[in-house]
Interface confidence: low
């Protein structure tokens, strides 16, 4: 039936609209920066590593490179830093900065990303004397989506960028419901057009069964709305056992009285204030 494809154009449109923050981040009107931070938008599943690349226009002799996350109040929380003479890890060792062989590019990685790592990130360079300069890269957005179990063979794989994002899920579910309604309407039209005398009451039954079992309809009957609650949970949910990577538990700060949405994570490093993180010299005599 042609109407089976009903919801997908809508989902496709939603997906296209979902990219708009990237257009803003990559705005051509944005002033040129000697620092670039890419990709402008990055989506990973929880438990996967999320890696941004911060690139310097040239290789200064003396500089400090910081990796930041924007807090809900638009303040920069330092996650980790690279200094010419050493790498400073933040309090949370999941945030790692690695200099690449060309000397200009730095990988800034979140090891085993969590849902509440979603947010806006950037890098900043402080060029030390004699040519003191402070530069900030453009912002980039990280979306960490919920890890989904492998779907049964009959079910279609969920469209990208929807899982783990409430708005996308709601629109996706709505569009599927609309699709089902269209299918019901079409069934009703077909039932009205063709005479029912030949098959009797069985026509409706035999037409209804495939509707319930059809792949497009499956999400309506199998979707557990309880799965959506991670958006408001105060504790990072544990992924299903087979998918859970072995990792250290890290405390996350919970803001009482309001939802702990992905943009509201307070990283431990943001509590440092003026206190510098413990130093760690680079390769050679004292390996990290």
């Amino acid at each position: 039936m042609g109407s089976r494809r009903g919801p997908w154009p809508l989902v496709w449109a939603v997906l296209q609209l979902g990219w708009w923050p990237g257009w803003l981040l990559d705005s051509p009107d944005r002033p040129w920066s000697p620092l670039t931070f890419s990709p402008a938008q990055l989506t990973v599943q929880e438990g996967e590593n999320a890696t941004f690349t911060c690139s310097l226009a040239d290789i200064p002799d003396s500089f400090v490179l910081n990796w930041y996350r924007l807090s809900p109040r638009n303040q920069t929380d330092k996650l980790a830093a690279f200094q010419e003479d050493r790498i400073e890890p933040g309090r949370d060792r999941r945030f790692r900065v690695t200099r690449l062989p060309n000397g200009r590019d730095f990988h800034m990685s979140i090891v085993a990303a969590r849902l509440n790592d979603s947010g806006i990130y950037l890098c900043g360079a402080i060029y030390l004397p004699p040519n003191t300069q402070i530069n900030e890269s453009p912002r980039a957005e990280l979306s960490v989506t919920e890890r989904t179990l492998e779907p049964p063979t009959q079910s279609p794989s969920p469209p990208p960028r929807l899982s783990g994002q409430l708005q996308g899920l709601v629109i996706g579910v709505t569009s599927v419901l609309v699709g089902v309604l269209l299918l019901l309407l079409l069934t009703w039209v077909l039932a009205a057009v063709f005479p029912r005398a030949t098959r009797g009451a069985c026509v409706c039954g035999s037409e209804d069964e495939p509707l319930k079992e059809g792949p497009d309809a499956a999400p309506v009957f199998t979707l557990d709305y309880g799965e959506l609650d991670f958006q408001w949970r105060e504790k990072t949910p544990e992924p299903p056992a087979p998918c859970a990577p072995e990792q250290t538990e890290y405390a996350t700060i919970v803001f009482p009285g309001r939802p702990a949405s992905p943009g509201r994570r307070a990283s431990a490093s943001s509590l440092q204030g003026a206190q510098p993180p413990s130093p760690e010299d680079g390769p050679g005599l004292w390996p990290p």
């Epitope: 050493r86 200099r99 004699p130 010299d281 005599l285």
Partner: antibody
Framework: EVQLVESGGDLVKPAGSLRLSCLAS????????MSWVRQAPEKGLHLVAG????????YYKDAVKGRFTISRDNAKSIVYLQMNSLRVEDTAMYYC????????????WGQGTLVTVSS | DVVMTQTPLSLSVSPGETASISCKAS???????????LTWFRQKPGQSPHRLVY???HRHPGVPDRFSGSGSGTDFTLRISRVEADDTGLYYC?????????FGAGTKVELK
């Protein structure tokens, strides 16, 4: 401009002691590890001692272990090399070097201070 | 300790020619972070060493592009193109990845 100025070099008798100082300027001293590299007359370069930025980790060349002590005063931007039980073979030009283990290691050297151990 | 072997020990070049100095390390200088920690410097008589190139191929600020470093793992080369009178001196390679830092014996570059 990064500057490292060594002082304290002198002529000393074997088994004697000396304290070398290196005054740093032009960079955030407390953020960098520091080291001492020596060069015997007409000889190559050898790392003698190193200290990390906080001063809680040190390295010593085997030949000077137990005799030399590297330390630093971040408030004064000075790194020291206390040299005890000096031997003739310790005679060399001693250079203060910024950095100890890094991508940009060995970038800045002082002008050196000469230590001569002779009877 | 990592042994750094420089060749030749002495090099005589005419102005405008290209000089090449080789440095071999007894162990790989490639670090797990992807960088190779080899440095080249020059020492003029009565002066302290001055860094020319770090991390194999990155020129120190102010060093002319006539100086270029290359190589990987254990074999490295410093090339000085269009040699000038001011390029004379003792050239050293050094590694800053394995403790202790170690240096080559030096290559004396002089003009013909």
């Amino acid at each position: 401009e990064v500057q490292l100025v060594e002082s304290g070099g002198d002529l000393v008798k074997p088994a004697g002691s000396l304290r070398l100082s290196c005054l740093a300027s032009g960079f955030t001293f407390s953020s960098y590890s520091m080291s001492w590299v020596r060069q015997a007359p007409e000889k190559g370069l050898h790392l003698v001692a190193g200290i990390n930025s906080d001063g809680d980790r040190t390295y010593y060349k085997d030949a000077v272990k137990g005799r030399f002590t590297i330390s630093r005063d971040n408030a004064k931007s000075i790194v020291y090399l206390q040299m005890n039980s000096l031997r003739v073979e310790d005679t060399a030009m001693y250079y203060c070097v910024r950095g100890f283990s890094s991508f940009n290691g060995l970038g800045y050297w002082g002008q050196g201070t000469l230590v001569t151990v002779s009877s | 300790d990592v042994v750094m072997t420089q060749t030749p020990l002495s090099l005589s070049v005419s102005p405008g020619e290209t000089a090449s100095i080789s440095c071999k390390a007894s162990q790989s200088l490639l670090h797990s972070d992807g960088n190779t920690y080899l440095t080249w410097f020059r020492q003029k008589p009565g002066q302290s060493p001055h860094r020319l190139v770090y991390a194999v191929s990155h020129r120190h600020p102010g060093v002319p592009d006539r100086f270029s470093g290359s190589g990987s793992g254990t074999d490295f080369t410093l090339r000085i193109s269009r040699v000038e009178a001011d390029d004379t001196g003792l050239y050293y390679c050094g590694q800053v990845i394995h403790d202790p830092w170690t240096f080559g014996a030096g290559t004396k570059v002089e003009l013909k």
